[in-house]
């Protein structure tokens, strides 16, 4: 019985499905494009399993390949809105260290409203992810419009 | 020999993989938002290895933390009649047990034909998610531009 | 401590997480609406571990149920060019073994320069996936813009 | 309870304009598109076009291009439908309908009969 | 454009017994599992009602005596059994593409 309980806890410690789900905190002063994330049980269904956050930025616990993962809406938006104030691109990328900094994802929003998207890479201890959203449109804070994640897939 | 097949077993029984990828079957009556999902083999290719589905809605069976994701094309559908019954929206929620009724991802379509979306969340053995299409257009039923599933990826 | 390293191993080895995510290489000639992949760590962020490439396709090595992701931006598009050169469409299936044909995944880009979505499937070994684009416009070669994945997720 | 109210009967003579109201009450104005719908006396009825209300974008059928213009004035809940350079042929009831989207035109108005003589 | 032919241009029928209208299209008006095909009713000096919406939907209080049928080019509206007030011309319309058309409607006369 105890070997089968020690089993089921081997994924989660020794593989460590390292996990997260974030809501928008809130988007930076005028000339930082990056988007502030928050999570835990208290702010409703976002949260960190591994990976912590620093100063609102993504940092990652362990090496590995993860799903990335992101919806961001713009708050105040109808498809003559969003293009009208062309271009709105969000990028999702490495920002920290600045050895590995590269982006990642990069979605414009043309005559849309929400962007969405995912992918596999390769993130290792240490890295800090940042989404940065350039252009004058603010995004939503509602939890089911706009999140940001990433899951642990493998080594 | 037996030892390694019972760890194959392993993560399937005892961590419970579940997940499923639903079809769309059809739509409710006028008044009533709710996409009707079906899957099978027997369907093509969605499949319920877990979860289940209730008149058309699906149902958690484990708790833990779960991969949402979901593509809806609209039937006939330009950038222009997209726009005809504005907003039309999409929503994916827990909506029962009513005491965690929630909101989990909404998407409009704005001047688009298809929205697609996933994120993370965590949801417990009982939730059943609904899947509400507001306005008056109709999704597409071919199962590759119209399809809703689950992952589940850690207790 | 050497059971604790076995027991890591064996979701890769035993279970075989397979998992690629790979970048545009290039399109075909003018009647072949394929897109032709190419992944490696020598290339940047992209990789195969698991599913091969065959002249430019991605072929599965095990079965399973996969998670199927893609991301395609047009490389010189506004929402007026999308809408020129409509339908511009983007569609994942299985090209080969030809009995096991079908199309998994199919979005058009209507006003927009992006299309992105993630679908669950039942694949086997030797099921060769394809990406066809079809339309007069040609996709981004940004490894930020345009890739495209699968994860084994389950048998 | 939802109505589409449109404005009177017209008698006008060729090369004449004539703009037909249809004010709508009892549903949200820009959720919903507008048609509007042709009938020649003893005729069945055409298809003449529709506006999307929340954009303002018209789409007309090829035999409505040029001398027909939908418009909206969104504040009072009405759709316009402007004829220019009139025709004997235009001699009609001109009804609006909304656009219940894949659903079909589930509300009507009562039509406005335009007559062109000379 | 799609063309629609309804036929016949105009029946009678007796009160009580069957009414059956079709309604050709040129081309197919059915896709992603949808026929996008819809039946209106139109009395005298009356705008046209809609009665039946993708293909075989009865609308919001319509009687139980209005049916339809058909996919792909062939659509049927019946109406059973056949009352006084129903004495109208009935029109199909398609929304499948634009521009959306009529059919030339079929005038029906109660016996």
């Known amino acids: 019985q105890r070997f089968a309980q020690a089993q089921q806890q081997l994924p989660l410690e020794s593989l460590g499905w390292d996990v997260a789900e974030l809501q928008l905190n809130h988007t930076g002063p005028q000339q930082d494009p990056r988007l502030y994330w928050q999570g835990g049980p208290a702010l409703g269904r976002s949260f960190l399993h591994g990976p912590e956050l620093d100063k609102g930025q993504l940092r990652i616990h362990r090496d590995g390949i993860y799903m990335v993962h992101i919806q961001v809406t713009l708050a105040i938006c109808s498809s003559t809105t969003a293009s009208r104030h062309h271009p709105t691109t969000l990028a999702v990328g490495i920002c920290s260290p600045a050895s590995r900094s590269i982006s990642l994802l990069r979605l414009s929003f043309h005559q849309g409203c929400t962007i969405a998207s995912q992918r596999l890479t390769p993130l290792a201890r240490g890295d800090t992810l940042c989404t940065n959203l350039t252009g004058t449109l603010l995004p939503s804070r509602n939890t089911d419009e706009t999140f940001f994640g990433v899951q642990w897939v493998r080594p | 020999q037996r030892f390694a097949q019972a760890q194959q077993q392993l993560p399937l029984e005892s961590l419970g993989w579940d997940v499923a990828e639903l079809q769309l079957n059809h739509t409710g009556p006028q008044q009533d938002p709710r996409l009707y999902w079906q899957g099978g083999p027997a369907l093509g290719r969605s499949f319920l290895h877990g979860p289940e589905l209730d008149k058309g809605q699906l149902r958690i069976h484990r708790d833990g933390i779960y991969m949402v994701h979901i593509q809806v094309t609209l039937a006939i559908c330009s950038s222009t009649t997209a726009s005809r019954h504005h907003p039309t929206t999409l929503a994916v929620g827990i909506c029962s047990p009513a005491s965690r009724s929630i909101s989990l991802l909404r998407l409009s379509f704005h001047q688009g034909c298809t929205i697609a979306s996933q994120r993370l969340t965590p949801l417990a053995r009982g939730d059943t998610l609904c899947t509400n299409l507001t306005g008056t257009l109709l999704p597409s039923r071919n199962t590759d531009e119209t399809f809703f599933g689950v992952q589940w990826v850690r207790p | 401590q050497r059971f604790a390293q076995a027991q890591q191993q064996l979701p890769l080895e035993s279970l075989g997480w397979d998992v690629a995510e790979l970048q545009l290489n290039h399109t075909g000639p003018q009647q072949d609406p394929r897109l032709y992949w190419q992944g490696g760590p020598a290339l940047g962020r992209s990789f195969l571990h698991g599913p091969e490439l065959d002249k430019g396709q991605l072929r599965i090595h095990r079965d399973g149920i996969y998670m199927v992701h893609i991301q395609v931006t047009l490389a010189i598009c506004s929402s007026t060019t999308a809408s020129r050169h409509h339908p511009t469409t983007l569609a994942v299936g299985i090209c080969s073994p030809a009995s096991r044909s079908i199309s998994l995944l199919r979005l058009s880009f209507h006003q927009g320069c992006t299309i992105a979505s993630q679908r669950l499937t039942p694949l086997a070994r030797g099921d060769t996936l394809c990406t066809n684009l079809t339309g007069t416009l040609l996709p981004s070669r940004n490894t930020d813009e345009t890739f495209f994945g699968v994860q084994w997720v389950r048998p | 309870q939802i109505q589409l109210v449109q404005s009177g009967p017209e008698v006008k003579k060729p090369g004449e304009t004539v703009k037909i109201s249809c004010k709508a009450s009892g549903y949200t104005f820009t959720n919903y598109g507008m048609n509007w719908v042709k009938q020649a006396p003893g005729k069945g009825l055409k298809w003449m076009g529709w506006?999307?209300?929340?954009?303002?974008?018209?789409t007309y059928a090829d035999a409505f291009k040029g001398r027909f213009a939908f418009s909206l004035e969104t504040s009072a809940s009405t759709a316009y439908l402007q004829i220019n350079n009139l025709k004997n042929e235009d001699t009609a009831t001109y009804f609006c309908?909304?656009?219940?989207?894949?659903?079909?035109?589930?509300?009507w108005g009562q039509g406005t009969s335009v007559t062109v003589s000379s | 454009d799609i063309v629609l032919t309804q036929s016949p241009a105009s029946l009678a029928v007796s009160l009580g017994q069957r009414a059956t209208i079709s309604c050709r299209a040129s081309k197919s008006v059915s896709t992603s599992g949808y026929s996008f095909m819809h039946w209106y009713q139109q009395k005298p000096g009356q705008p046209p009602k809609l009665l039946i919406y993708l293909a075989s939907n009865l609308e919001s209080g319509v009687p139980a005596r209005f049916s339809g049928s058909g996919s792909g080019t062939d659509f049927t509206l019946n109406i059973h059994p056949v009352e006084e007030e129903d004495a109208a011309t009935y029109y199909c319309q398609h929304s499948r593409e634009v521009p959306w058309t009529f059919g030339g409607g079929t005038k029906l006369e109660i016996k």
């Open positions: 506006i999307n209300t929340y954009t303002g974008e018209p």
């Open positions: 309908a909304r656009d219940y989207g894949d659903y079909g035109m589930d509300y």
